[in-house]
């Protein structure tokens, strides 16, 4: 049975030509965490394995950078990274949890960070 | 099996810079984050920042900005720290360390710095 | 930036003897890592995500908490378990250490 939970940093906006954070935490579970995935919407942005450490994909390699932790910074942001950011972890024995993150892209000064939330 | 191997203690003045080297084997240096600990005896461990070897990011904690300088040089797997404008204040024990996403799992052996006036 | 506060600062415990330190945060974190650290040499990764044992640590060790209060824990007391233990947060930046325990055997 599926124990865990992913706790996000939920919907964030930030400036454009600015960075951001996003993490992910999975709780509630003893399993060991092999590998996590981060993708946006259908594309591949970085996998951190838990033998062979990071690996960002080629077309992110100036601007993603790994950490803190399991999490991920984007750099000089524009307004085409606006949208859907997904953690998948991968874990033994439960399987796979995925949370997911919503990033808004702004013109303005006018950034703020969304509450913390949980996907069970 | 991974390993960080520090350069050897420096007497520096007061005022000087001070370049210590971090050399990496036994894993892929570009695939981890490698970050760099001050130790004193007084003030214990105190995170200074880390590169990314992959593409050189850098992030550094604000108090050591301007201060400390990480760089990486991928042909010799190789980190670097400068240190400029020593002052006593900067007389301690500095570590390497690599980091995966799962806490600092390998340290090297620090590299021991005194500043004299 | 997180503080993280320590305590007790330095201890001592007979072998055999549970023993519990603690690590309290200045605002929430999401995990914890521990550090083990013996004079005259580097630190060394001990737990890692709250509650994981690093490779070659003995099972008699544990770790647990969240949000704010964490905790490592020996269940008996052995003599090659004397040393300085550090906690370390890397939830927010900068990543912070704490000021560390120092136990010592009875």
């Known amino acids: 049975m599926m124990t865990g939970t992913i706790e996000t940093t939920g919907n964030i906006s930030a400036e454009k030509g600015g960075s951001i954070i996003l993490q992910c935490h999975l709780s509630s579970t003893t399993a060991q965490v092999t590998q996590v995935n981060w993708e946006q919407q259908d594309q591949l942005l970085a996998i951190c394995n838990a033998d062979l450490g990071w690996h960002i994909s080629p077309s992110f390699k100036d601007r993603v950078a790994p950490g803190p932790g399991l999490g991920l910074t984007l750099q000089s942001l524009t307004v085409n990274d606006t949208g859907e950011y997904f953690c998948i972890y991968h874990t033994y024995p439960d399987g796979t949890y995925t949370g997911r993150i919503f990033l808004e892209v702004l013109e303005s000064s006018v950034a703020e960070h969304g509450a913390r939330f949980q996907i069970p | 099996q991974a390993y960080l191997q520090q350069s050897g203690a420096e007497l520096v003045r007061s005022g000087a810079s001070v370049k210590m080297s971090c050399k990496a084997s036994?894993?892929?240096?570009?695939?981890?984050?490698l970050h760099w600990i001050k130790q004193t005896p007084g003030q214990g461990l105190k995170w200074i920042g880390y590169?990314?070897?992959?593409?050189?990011?850098?992030n550094y904690n604000q108090k050591f900005k301007g201060k400390a300088t990480l760089t990486a040089d991928t042909s010799s797997s190789t980190a670097y720290m400068q240190i400029n404008s020593l002052t006593s204040e900067d007389s301690a024990v500095y570590f390497c360390?690599?980091?995966?996403?799962?806490?600092?799992?390998?340290w090297g052996q620090g590299t021991s710095v005194t500043v004299s006036s | 930036q997180i503080v993280l506060t320590q305590s007790p600062v330095i201890m001592s415990a007979s072998p055999g003897e549970k023993v519990t330190m603690t690590c309290s945060a200045t605002?929430?974190?999401?995990?914890m890592h521990w550090y083990q650290q013996k004079s005259g040499t580097s630190p060394k990764r001990w737990i890692y995500?709250?509650?994981k044992l690093a490779s070659g640590v003995p099972i008699r060790f544990s770790g647990s908490g969240s949000g704010t209060s964490y905790s490592l824990t020996i269940s008996s007391m052995e003599a090659e378990d004397a040393a300085t233990y550090y906690c370390?947060?890397?939830?927010?930046?900068?990543?912070?250490f704490g000021a560390g325990t120092k136990l010592e055997l009875k």
């Open positions: 360390a690599r980091e995966g996403g799962w806490a600092m799992d390998y």
């Open positions: 036994g894993y892929t240096f570009t695939s981890y984050n």
């Open positions: 590169i990314y070897p992959g593409n050189g990011y850098t």
């Open positions: 605002s929430s974190v999401s995990s």
């Open positions: 995500d709250t509650s």
């Open positions: 370390q947060q890397w939830s927010s930046n900068p990543s912070t």
